[in-house]
């Protein structure tokens, strides 16, 4: 069997969700030594990086201006050391937003309930669209997908106060073109007196691990690349 | 204080529509959820529907689908629900209801339905 | 859509005495249940929200509890201004759906 490196980590930098016109930056985060990275764009090649020096950098960044429809899909890289190359990475869904119009979204029974209430979202949109996203704030990767011709809803609950946060909602043109986002709804639960303080789920800081972690190579950097590689794949 | 204020009654012809009016004061209209309720003549209560006047988001009960249709004047903090094709099983008590939890009741509009 | 079972459909009492009415969910509707009085001329008024939250100028001989799907609804000491009708009405799920209604009449 031919011999390859381990795949490298793909993210992109402060969100994968990327409003028209504004440029997307995307990680490729591999092995020091790398002499070259390709990102691939829905299976072909998009873009070639060759870090300078290779030995020193354990990653590069894809650049993306003006971002539209057209380069908004899939994106996975792969790097090579010498003559070998990696496996490739996973997928990295890359979204265009601002497209269109703007919905609205609001909540049922209100935005201040008590835990154990169940809660529904309801995000309209009238212009033409089929599929509608809700994500809350600080926790984008985890977006909910409903279908409507002009509404959908979200039922959620019976909530905790695992549920509090700002919510938003958007309208899809198809799976990576997104409408502008609606304003939040606060999402405010009280009561469950036991349970009040940071639950498990709740992020303490917005989409904390949407960041590259490229590094330049020092002595110590050496001994942990290793270290820094695994971290990255349990983090993921 | 809240207050939603509804026609006492209406006297339709069958097959003819009517639009009930319900008026809003004392909180801010466009924050809450508004349900439409019917109660017909020593029955029990039936939910219609509910709109949000902020953002135009309407949930129907799928048995009144075809029968009603919520919309809301911002300007005047008025909820209307049009009842289309009348009948007598129409005859009814319509109750406006403020706020996603049923808070505050309208005083009902009673439709009569009689040629 | 949830069924909701009222009983009993119909209680006579009297004056002082404690009387409980219950609402069984068909289905899962967490705590968002409330109770409703309805007068003789039609007005109605909530008195319980959130299955045990009391509405504001409700006397406190209402209460409101659950115990898995079975929810109820106690009037500690009836006075006379309680002999009317209740409803249950979940609001969890759309449609929502009212019980069929308890008629409290003085004994």
């Known amino acids: 069997p031919k011999q390859t490196l381990p795949k490298p980590i793909i993210r992109a930098e402060s969100t994968y969700m990327v409003p028209k016109e504004k440029q997307a930056t995307l990680c490729c985060q591999g092995s020091y030594g790398a002499v070259e990275y390709q990102l691939h764009f829905e299976g072909s090649l998009f873009a070639v990086e060759r870090p300078k020096p290779p030995e020193r950098i354990n990653g590069v960044k894809f650049h993306i201006p003006d971002m539209n429809s057209r380069k908004a899909g899939r994106y996975s890289c792969i790097y090579r050391v010498g003559e070998l190359w990696s496996e490739r990475s996973d997928l990295l869904d890359l979204v265009v937003t601002e497209m269109y119009d703007t919905p609205t979204l609001s909540v049922h029974p209100g935005p201040e309930v008590t835990s154990g209430e169940k809660v529904t979202f309801y995000c309209r949109l009238d212009t033409a669209t089929s599929m509608f996203l809700l994500l809350k704030e600080g926790r984008s990767r985890d977006v909910q997908r409903s279908y409507g011709k002009v509404q959908a809803e979200f039922p959620m609950g019976p909530v905790t106060t695992a549920h509090r946060g700002s919510y938003r909602c958007f309208g899809s043109y198809n799976n990576y073109a997104w409408s502008f986002p609606s304003e939040p709804v606060k999402l405010l639960v009280t009561g469950d007196i036991e349970n009040t303080s940071l639950a498990p789920t709740d992020p303490t800081f917005p989409d904390s691990w949407d960041t590259c972690l490229l590094t330049r190579e020092t002595g110590l950097q050496k001994d942990l690349a290793l270290w820094d590689h695994t971290a990255q794949n349990l983090l993921r | 204080q809240v207050q939603l204020q509804q026609p006492g009654a209406e006297l339709v012809k069958p097959g003819a529509s009517v639009k009930l009016s319900c008026k809003a004061s004392g909180y801010t209209f466009t924050s809450y959820w508004m349900h439409w309720v019917k109660q017909r003549p020593g029955q029990g209560l039936e939910w219609i529907g509910m709109?949000?006047?902020?953002?135009?988001?309407?949930n129907y009960n799928e048995k009144f689908k075809s029968k009603a249709t919520l919309t809301v004047d911002k300007s005047s903090s008025t909820a209307y629900m049009q009842l289309s094709s009348l009948t007598s099983e129409d005859s009814a008590v319509y109750y406006c209801?403020?706020?996603?939890?049923?808070?505050?009741w309208g005083q009902g509009t009673l439709v009569t339905v009689s040629a | 859509d949830i069924q909701m079972t009222q009983s009993p459909s119909s209680l006579s009492a009297s004056l002082g005495e404690r009387v409980s009415l219950t609402c069984r969910a068909s289905q899962d509707i967490g705590s968002s249940l409330n109770w409703l009085q309805q007068e003789p001329d039609g007005t109605i008024k909530r008195l319980i929200y959130?299955?045990?939250s009391l509405d504001s100028g409700v006397p406190k001989r209402f209460s409101g509890s659950r115990s898995g799907s079975d929810y109820s609804l106690t009037i500690s000491s009836l006075e006379s201004e309680d002999f009317v009708d209740y409803y249950c009405l979940q609001y969890a799920s759309s449609p929502f759906t009212f019980g069929s209604g308890t008629k409290l009449e003085i004994k």
């Open positions: 959130a299955t045990s």
């Open positions: 209801v403020y706020d996603g939890r049923f808070a505050y």
């Open positions: 709109i949000h006047p902020n953002s135009g988001s309407t």
